[in-house]
Interface confidence: low
């Protein structure tokens, strides 16, 4: 009933709660002397379903058979309509349409840790649309049964708040869940288990690692576990890897030796536990332990290259360069590099430790045979030294690689190709391709890059430290014993027309011709490798086409003579620069009048 129903009653048969698809009979009847005031046969009883009229009848009572009610709650209200007055509410009723509960499925119980409590979950099946109460029962030894009720709307989990203990680990317990509502009840299939079946250990904790004598080969992992744990599984991986190494251990008692760890590597370790070989479930993985393994002495050898530069008749500058060892070769933090320079005939040797750099420059006499050895040292020792005899890398013309070319290969790559030298190609032991940014004046501080190529290769793709719109000086060396030959070329990965033309800084007169001098275009404005300069000139006030002179680009050149100017005529001169992509805009304009005598 939804109000006091003073004027009449609404009755529902067979029940206010019905099965989906059932029919109900609803009766609305007026109490004595509650009809219309003047003439009771004018009573008009109207039945509403929510706000919609579904039936009416003149008299003291109304009967209505209702079918097809939807799942959920439907409100029926009976009203009285008298002539010349508003409808008066008599009474009402709610009808609840639902279904009997389905059998709960997949009942499973778990106890998290030896000190945890038993909790069970199940699948309810389809919604009953009615108030449904779930009762969970657990029957165990000594004829004891625990039971707990759940009155949530959607109940599919209950924690008993009881703790199963391992006194009799083989004792059976049986769980069952029963769902009850007004239309029926249904019970799950019973689930029978022992302590060992349902206890899921807590993950191990307090994980530590120890390295005996600071050695990666003598490593022990320690952890703490719950008392009944029989099995453990360990997983570990380098922190930068996605793949785990797995180890299963029995009766480990909280320790295990690991034999295959790499030195100077940060690892992540996790452990899981289980109480029984084939019963129960594995714990969650423990929290990760992250630890770095100790260093070991470096393996591998440094890749060393060098440059020679003539200083004067008696001295030469040697610049040594080397590449960092890979992480797996360094096996620790490289503290310094040891460079030894030795004159082979006289036996004089000089050793120096280099920190923070992968290059070293020194000045040595041009006479004598010199060799260098370079090794890398960490806290545990040094790598094997790389030994190189210093020679004139380009001395043997017959060893010079032929037809060297450099072509752009996609973004920031240059493909260098060559033909073997004319001298017996089988004599070549290896090729070295070297590249550095082209800087006018041959700045020795510009970083040097190189790669080694097998003697049967005739191409190399260079991509390291290659930037767009920068010109690189590329050399290909062919090495054979103590001899070397080289060829060079300029190349870029991407080019466009230079952003500016050369700046003419001086024009001087020499014996009836002029010498034009200019400043190089800044490297960042060259936009690739320059191929030519052009010098333009025309008479000052003339509209005629300018004349021009095209000069092949050479790194060191910054002046050029012109001898086709007429004396005592004022000319305007300017310059441009060209790459393979096109011509720059004009540089500055200069006026000049040749003073020499006319022919």
């Amino acid at each position: 009933k939804i109000d006091a129903c003073k004027r009449g009653d609404v009755t529902v048969k067979p029940s206010h709660v019905i099965l989906l698809g059932s029919t109900v009979n609803i009766t609305c009847s007026l109490k004595p002397r509650q009809g219309c005031f003047h003439y009771s046969r004018r009573n008009k009883l109207i039945l509403y379903k929510f706000d919609r009229r579904i039936n009416f009848h003149h008299g003291h009572s109304l009967n209505s058979q209702v079918t097809g009610l939807p799942l959920g709650t439907t409100l029926f209200v009976c009203k009285l309509a008298c002539i010349n007055s508003d409808e008066i509410q008599i009474c009402g009723a709610e009808i609840f349409v639902g279904v009997a509960p389905e059998q709960p499925q997949n009942l499973s119980c778990i106890q998290k840790g030896e000190q945890g409590t038993v909790a069970c979950t199940w699948e309810r099946g389809r919604d009953t649309h009615l108030y449904t109460e779930y009762t969970l029962q657990l029957s165990g030894p000594k004829n004891l049964t625990w039971q707990k009720q759940c009155k949530d709307i959607y109940c599919d989990y209950l924690d008993f708040g009881i703790n199963l203990t391992p006194e009799s680990p083989e004792s059976n317990f049986t769980a069952k869940v029963t769902a009850v509502n007004s239309l029926g009840s249904s019970s799950s299939l019973p689930s029978t288990f022992t302590f060992l079946d349902i206890v899921r250990p807590l993950p191990p904790w307090d994980i530590r690692i120890k390295f005996q004598k600071a050695s990666v080969s003598r490593c022990t992992l320690y952890w703490r576990d719950e008392g009944l744990v029989l099995l453990n599984r360990l997983r570990y991986r380098p922190s930068n890897s996605r793949l785990w190494n797995m180890v299963n251990v029995t009766k480990a008692k909280g320790r295990h030796d690991l034999l295959d760890l790499k030195p100077f590597t940060e690892y992540e370790f996790q452990i899981s536990s289980k109480l029984h070989l084939y019963k129960g479930s594995w714990s969650d993985w423990s929290e990760s332990l992250r630890a770095q393994t100790p260093e070991e002495e470096p393996t591998g050898m440094l890749d060393v290259w060098y440059m020679k530069r003539h200083i004067d008749y008696s001295r030469q500058q040697i610049s040594l360069f080397w590449k960092n060892l890979s992480v797996s070769e360094a096996r620790g933090k490289i503290l310094h590099y040891q460079v030894t320079l030795q004159e082979l005939t006289g036996g004089k040797a000089m050793t120096q430790n280099i920190t923070g750099h992968t290059s070293w420059t020194t000045v040595i006499p041009r006479t004598g045979n010199w060799a260098v050895a370079v090794s890398a040292a960490n806290s545990k020792g040094s790598s094997l030294p790389t030994r190189i005899n210093i020679m004139n890398l380009c001395e043997a013309g017959l060893l010079a690689p032929r037809q060297v070319s450099a072509n752009s290969e996609g973004m920031d790559n240059i493909l260098v190709t060559w033909q073997p030298p004319r001298k017996d190609p089988s004599a070549v032991q290896e090729y070295v391709v070297e590249w550095r940014e082209l800087h006018p004046g041959g700045d020795t501080q510009v970083p040097l890059n190189w790669l080694r190529s097998r003697p049967y290769n005739v191409s190399a793709l260079i991509s390291e430290n290659i930037k767009s719109y920068i010109c690189y000086e590329i050399r290909v060396y062919a090495l054979s014993g103590d001899q070397g030959g080289c060829s060079s070329i300029l190349g870029n990965s991407k080019h466009k027309a230079p952003l500016s033309g050369p700046h003419i800084n001086a024009i001087t007169e020499e014996k009836g011709s002029i010498l034009i001098s200019w400043n190089s275009i800044p490297v960042q404005e060259q936009m690739g490798c320059l191929l030519h300069y052009r010098i333009y000139w025309k008479e000052r006030d003339s509209n005629s086409q300018p004349q021009l002179c095209e000069i092949p680009y050479r790194v060191s050149q910054n002046s050029h003579p012109i001898n086709s100017l007429q004396p005592r005529v004022t000319y305007v001169l300017w310059m441009t620069a060209l790459t393979a992509a096109g011509e720059s805009s004009h540089g500055n304009e200069r006026e000049f009048c040749l003073q020499g005598k006319a022919n």
Epitope: C150, K151, D152, I153, Y154, C155, D156, Y157
Partner: nanobody, 123 residues
Framework: QVQLQESGGGLVQAGGSLSLSCAAS????????MGWYRQAPGKQRELVAA???????IYHDSVKGRFTISRDNADSTVWLQMNSLKPDDTAVYYC?????????????????WGKGTQVTVSS
């Protein structure tokens, strides 16, 4: 102990809007879920919308697209913006909160409840 105080209920015409607000006080700093339930006369209490501290939102199908729940974790406050209201939305609206995260809690068994605020939508 956590106290929940609702405000913002009232009478509104169908198609109109209302905004409900609920502020938690007491030991509210560890509340995970905060949400709104409603109970119309003679009906079971039903979840309308809920939100957890990570910003996950849950809505009853009947209000999806019309109601928006939002939350200020720092102030332990939750709001329910109700647009395009219908007469079916008439009910007492309860604010509820819980430190746990289980679905059954969400569905009706939350630990903390407000006293409720009446929302009436007239046609």
């Amino acid at each position: 102990q956590v106290q929940l105080q609702e405000s913002g209920g009232g009478l509104v015409q169908a198609g109109g809007s209302l905004s409900l607000s609920c502020a938690a006080s007491g030991s509210a700093f560890r509340l995970n879920f905060m949400g709104w339930y409603r109970q119309a006369p003679g009906k079971q209490r039903e979840l309308v919308a809920a939100i957890n501290s990570g910003g996950t939102e849950i809505y009853h199908d009947s209000v999806k697209g019309r109601f928006t729940i939002s939350r200020d974790n720092a102030d332990s406050t939750v709001w329910l913006q109700m647009n395009s209201l219908k007469p079916d939305d008439t009910a007492v609206y309860y604010c509820a909160a819980d430190r746990g995260i289980s679905w059954s809690k969400l569905a009706g068994g939350m630990d903390y409840w407000g006293k409720g605020t009446q929302v009436t939508v007239s046609s």
